[in-house]
């Protein structure tokens, strides 16, 4: 089965620059299929833009200005790239790549879409670091005692742009856990969002991870915020100086215990 | 040019109560095209639901039913037993791949229909209220209440800022909410909730602990030093990133 990944959750550009949006195809040979690009402007219908066929033929939608979009594919990396030249306000949109995927029976085809990349155009000069800054909240004793469950809360602040994806996993598991989240909120020139995960008592002794995807994450990798297991000693982390881990970094906390 | 027009911009549905989405075609006969349905959820993920000839995306066949009404020029999608997972924007789209019509392998989309999911009408349930703290940050967690109307107050004399609460459907089909705020004196902040003409306090849920229980976090101190990136510690602890915590037993 074909699968499409668009590694850039968003792409922020200033006017007249060039944006390059990537789409990685897996489960199917890119040189044996056509890749399609669609855009969804705010408040408008999703519209076909351009496609590149298995033999490299490019087809543009009528009415799309020539020279605006360029599409290509790199078989070695199984990637299709949509290049948007001379970006302007009207290019603000979410861009999706797509392909026709044959189902089990030949002839039964469906079109699958990538997760989309939002093109953001800004004229602001932002601080150097506009990646999400995490704060963790551990379950209250009252909740764990009374409800035999605990809620972890992951607060992310001072990020730009507003496009962010948060999910939760147990350590050493790739299963995405069912979580809940608030709306993304504007705070001055940046944004904040929080997500929370309620787990049963039996899972409180496991380490949990709040995984954050954002355009400005360090090194362009998902940020992993570690929530330590809750056993007999509950800890809280510092809000201002959280240390989240990128890639395979491991978070190390040094705790000082003061007995009464 | 053809146009796919959803019957409604927004459709509120109740958990477990069947709902029908309709999409009409303007400027053409819908029978000349194959109809597809997609769902876009939070985070822009576009998921394939249905394509004619009984083709369903993974996990959709049991709870969704697609159809086309040629006489009325309508595409129809039924959600047989909606759950909170079904919230999102639903799009009808058409193509003529494999049809006796003008061949096109691009999809033509209609505007989305926003489906909002509400819990099924049920007996009123009083919330549980818990406070979570970290430094100046305080979160008030309000769990398992019905109906939705609620007022959450974080009680403090030294407010820095407060945010609008997030109210969502809980997995059990009631509501959960979280309200966040920043306070100079976070240790003294409590949460009170007005729901169903009653007031519920976080202090109602506090438990007395003895030394065999959880260590109750009291305060967090931070050794402020020049900020550096997180390294990969092996045997070394980079002191500039050590969180100093005072845990009172």
């Amino acid at each position: 089965a074909g699968h499409l990944e668009q590694p850039q959750i968003s792409s922020t550009k200033t006017l007249s620059k060039t944006a390059r949006l990537e789409c990685v195809v897996s489960g199917i040979t890119i040189s044996a299929t056509s890749v399609y690009w669609y855009r969804e402007r705010p408040g408008e219908v999703i519209q076909f833009l351009v496609s590149i066929s298995y033999d490299g033929t490019v087809r543009k939608e009528s009415g799309i200005p020539s020279g605006k979009f360029e599409v290509d594919r790199i078989p070695e990396t199984s990637t299709s790239t949509l290049t948007i030249h001379n970006v302007e306000k009207q290019d603000i949109a979410t861009y999706y790549c797509a392909l026709w995927e044959a189902q089990q029976e030949l002839g039964k085809k469906i079109k699958v879409f990538g997760p989309g990349t939002k093109l953001i155009i800004t004229d602001k000069q932002l601080d150097a670091d506009v990646s999400p800054k995490p704060t963790i909240f551990l379950p209250s004793i009252a909740e764990t005692k009374l409800q035999k469950a605990g809620t972890y809360l992951c607060l992310l602040e001072k990020f730009f742009p507003d496009v962010i994806k948060i999910h939760w996993q147990e350590k050493k598991s790739n299963t995405i856990l069912g979580s809940q989240e608030g709306n993304t909120m504007k705070t001055n020139d940046t944004y904040m969002k929080f997500s929370w995960l309620t787990v049963p008592e039996k899972s409180l002794d496991k380490e949990h991870r709040c995984i954050v995807r954002h355009e400005n994450n360090k090194n362009g990798v998902d940020q992993e915020i570690i929530f330590p297991p809750i056993k007999t000693d509950v800890i809280t982390m510092d809000p201002k100086d959280n240390c989240s881990k990128d890639a395979n970094d491991t978070l190390l906390l040094q705790l000082t215990n003061t007995s009464a | 040019a053809i146009e796919l027009v959803p019957e409604h911009q927004t459709v509120p549905v109740s958990i477990g109560v069947p709902a029908t989405l309709r999409c009409s075609m303007k400027g053409e006969a819908i029978g000349n095209y194959y109809i597809n349905w997609y769902r876009k959820t939070q985070g822009n993920t576009m998921t394939f639901i249905y394509r004619e000839k009984d083709i369903y995306g993974p996990g959709f066949k049991d709870n969704f039913q697609g159809d086309i009404d040629i006489a009325k020029n309508l595409a129809v999608l039924k959600i047989l037993a909606p759950s909170e997972r079904d919230e999102g924007s639903y799009y009808c789209a058409c193509d003529t791949l494999g049809m006796g019509g003008e061949y096109t392998d691009k999809l033509i989309f209609g505007k989305g229909t926003r489906v909002t999911v509400e819990p099924r009408s049920q007996p009123h349930t009083k919330p549980s209220v818990f406070v979570m703290k970290n430094g100046t940050n305080v979160a008030c967690l309000v769990k398992e209440f019905y109906p939705k109307d609620i007022r959450i107050n974080l009680v403090s004399s030294k407010k820095i800022t407060e945010f609008d609460p997030a109210i969502v459907i809980s997995p059990s089909g009631k509501y959960n909410a979280v309200k966040l705020g920043k306070y100079e004196d976070s240790n003294s902040v409590t949460c009170s909730v007005q729901h169903d003409n009653k007031t519920v306090h976080s202090t109602d849920f506090e438990v007395k602990t003895d030394s065999t229980d959880h260590v109750k976090p009291k305060e967090t101190e931070n050794t402020k030093q020049p900020s550096k990136s997180c390294h990969k510690p092996k045997a070394i602890v980079h002191t500039e990133k050590v969180n100093m915590m005072s845990l009172t037993v």
Epitope: E105, L106, G107, K108 | G27, E28, A29, G31, N32, K53, I68, I70, L97, G98, M99, G100, G101, E102, Y103
Partner: antibody
């Protein structure tokens, strides 16, 4: 209720061109595909081709080299021309509306190819 | 283009169920239709999109289509159902008819 009516000569000489017209009344003409189907005596149905109101056509591959279809939206009519006819083209010719199926048919006109 | 194969004839007693099959390569991936034609008359659509009945067609007519076979079922067959029945399907460019089945009501 949509009605279709075929018209044209009932007798055509071999090697000549068969010409038929179908007039559509009491219904929408645009946005539909219109087809010609034929049936030799005592035999099955054979699809000849179809035309869209914009003029786009698709023909049966076995007849493609001899078939031409056209449309006149101002008169709600579409036409069939079949060139170089032989006795094997003798049949009842039906016009029909195509919407995922042939849902409306004319009553058919018999065309005999004979010298 | 693909071919559709039907049995030349099917017989049924009044009140019984008649089944007429139509087979073709991966027919289940396409939509199948069925037409009834009585002597001297134009064909009439009885089933479209595998299993849908146009208005005016009695409920005793039903259709199914999966794998390589589409089936027209007439339950409680009546004398007036005696006719030729044609299946039809399309692919991306052409329309194909089956050879026809003569239904005899004994």
């Amino acid at each position: 209720q949509v009605q279709l009516q075929e018209s044209g000569p009932g007798l055509v000489k071999p090697s000549e061109t068969l010409s038929l017209t179908c007039t559509v009344s009491y219904g929408s003409f645009s946005s539909f595909y219109w087809s010609w189907i034929r049936q030799p005596a005592g035999k099955g149905l054979e699809w000849i081709g179809r035309i869209y109101t914009s003029g786009g056509t698709i023909y049966n591959p076995s007849l493609k080299s001899r078939v031409t279809m056209s449309v006149d939206t101002s008169k709600n009519q579409f036409s069939l021309k079949l060139s170089s006819v032989t006795a094997a083209d003798t049949a009842v010719y039906y016009c029909a509306r195509w919407l995922r199926a042939f849902d409306y048919w004319g009553q058919g006109t018999l065309v005999t190819v004979s010298s | 283009s693909s071919e559709l194969t039907q049995p030349p004839s099917v017989s049924v007693s009044p009140g019984q169920t008649a089944s007429i099959t139509c087979s073709g390569d991966k027919l289940g991936d396409k939509y199948a239709c069925w037409y009834q034609q009585k002597p001297g008359q134009s064909p009439v659509l009885v089933i479209y999109q595998d299993s849908k009945r146009p208005s005016g067609i009695p409920e005793r007519f039903s259709g199914s289509n999966s794998g390589n076979t589409a089936t027209l079922t007439i339950s409680g067959t009546q004398a007036m159902d005696e006719a030729d029945y044609y299946c039809q399907a399309w692919d991306s460019s052409t329309v194909v008819f089956g050879g026809g089945t003569k239904l005899t009501v004994l």
